[in-house]
Interface confidence: low
Amino acid sequence: PEPPTACREKQYLINSQCCSLCQPGQKLVSDCTEFTETECLPCGESEFLDTWNRETHCHQHKYCDPNLGLRVQQKGTSETDTICTCEEGWHCTSEACESCVLHRSCSPGFGVKQIATGVSDTICEPCPVGFFSNVSSAFEKCHPWTSCETKDLVVQQAGTNKTDVVCGPQDRLRA
């Protein structure tokens, strides 16, 4: 018979013959022949292969280096790589999460719009009129100015984006 030129899914062509690929979690030991099936072996501990494959070596699991601020988010299996994330207060510098940097703080005059996560940095926003932030923080939002009126007081000093208003007693009319 004419040798195949196209193999089905999960097969590969070798020596004019279609052989089965090794399933995820296993590596190729030997190609199939006219008389034998493809021979595959499971990946060892700390190794993985995540696709149907004909790889002769499994990949090493990623190492989450604590010196780079990394820790294990999800332990790898024979079919999946280890997923690293960053220690509290830090976030990944890339999608691959190969290293971490400290979450940025929002300066006075700016508040936290979105608190940082393991993969994204703090998002700051300028405090709008009526709000202030007098600290550098990775958590604090802009606070509304104190309402002097509700305390039966009057504004003695206007607020800014960095300072609260200063309230004081109302002037009494002297007789």
């Epitope: 899914e9 999960k10 062509l13 696709t51 149907w52």
Partner: antibody, heavy 118, light 106 residues
Framework: VQLQESGPDLVKPSQSLSLTCTVT?????????WHWIRQFPGNKLEWMGY???????NYNPSLKSRISITRDTSKNQFFLQLNSVTTEDSATYFC????????????WGQGTTLTVSS | QIVLTQSPAFMSASPGEKVTMTCSAS?????MHWYQQKSGTSPKRWIY???KLASGVPARFSGSGSGTSYSLTISSMEAEDAATYYC?????????FGAGTKLEIK
């Protein structure tokens, strides 16, 4: 890995069409199968055929009498030739790599639009 | 050849809405694969081996099915999901695609 199609924008009916796919970032003789797919006006996709890294080919039976896929390994290019074209062959032509490990086309060119008209 | 029929051909969904589209094969297939295509771009790998998400695909997407009946589901529609989705099989030659489901945002 990047794929880039090139060829004429316009071909006359009954002539032959020749398109080139230039691959960068991966050798077409290393592994995988390298395909041509076209998309007609109205967006229907049709698989045309492929050349395997070993050089063997496989074509859609609907095109078998008119199609040829070849390659130039020194330039890391593969080619589509379609004979006796008609207006029905007007389409956007894509080249793509099929990754059997995931069973999908993992890299595509941006496509080249061909019009068949006299 | 195996014919893949996608339905509906067109649908629109509001943000947050659950969306399901189907792909029916004329004969049984082992796996179904899905691509997303936005206007003026090439198709992107989206779901492979029926239910596995390609790299970078949001977790709100899922795929399921077996035999002749397969589906793609979005748990909560977002504006960026508006696109045309194609199913594809290669359990038998020739490789075939469905005609696509065009999904728009309301």
């Amino acid at each position: 890995v990047q794929l880039q199609e090139s060829g004429p924008d316009l071909v006359k009916p009954s002539q032959s069409l020749s398109l080139t796919c230039t691959v960068t970032g991966y050798s077409i003789t290393s592994d995988y199968s390298w395909h041509w797919i076209r998309q007609f006006p109205g967006n229907k996709l049709e698989w045309m055929g492929y050349i395997y890294y070993s050089g063997s080919t496989n074509y859609n039976p609907s095109l078998k009498s008119r199609i040829s896929i070849t390659r130039d390994t020194s330039k890391n290019q593969f080619f589509l030739q379609l004979n006796s074209v008609t207006t029905e062959d007007s389409a956007t032509y894509f080249c793509a790599r099929f990754y059997y490990g995931y069973s999908f086309f993992d890299y595509w060119g941006q496509g080249t639009t061909l019009t068949v008209s006299s | 050849q195996i014919v893949l029929t996608q339905s509906p051909a067109f649908m629109s969904a509001s943000p947050g809405e659950k969306v399901t589209m189907t792909c029916s094969a004329s004969s049984s297939v082992s796996y179904m694969h899905w691509y997303q295509q936005k206007s003026g771009t090439s198709p992107k790998r989206w779901i492979y081996d029926t239910s596995k998400l390609a790299s970078g695909v949001p977790a709100r997407f899922s795929g399921s099915g077996s035999g002749t009946s397969y589906s793609l589901t979005i748990s909560s529609m977002e504006a960026e999901d508006a696109a045309t989705y194609y199913c594809q099989q290669w359990s038998s030659n020739p490789l075939t695609f469905g005609a696509g489901t065009k999904l728009e945002i309301k």
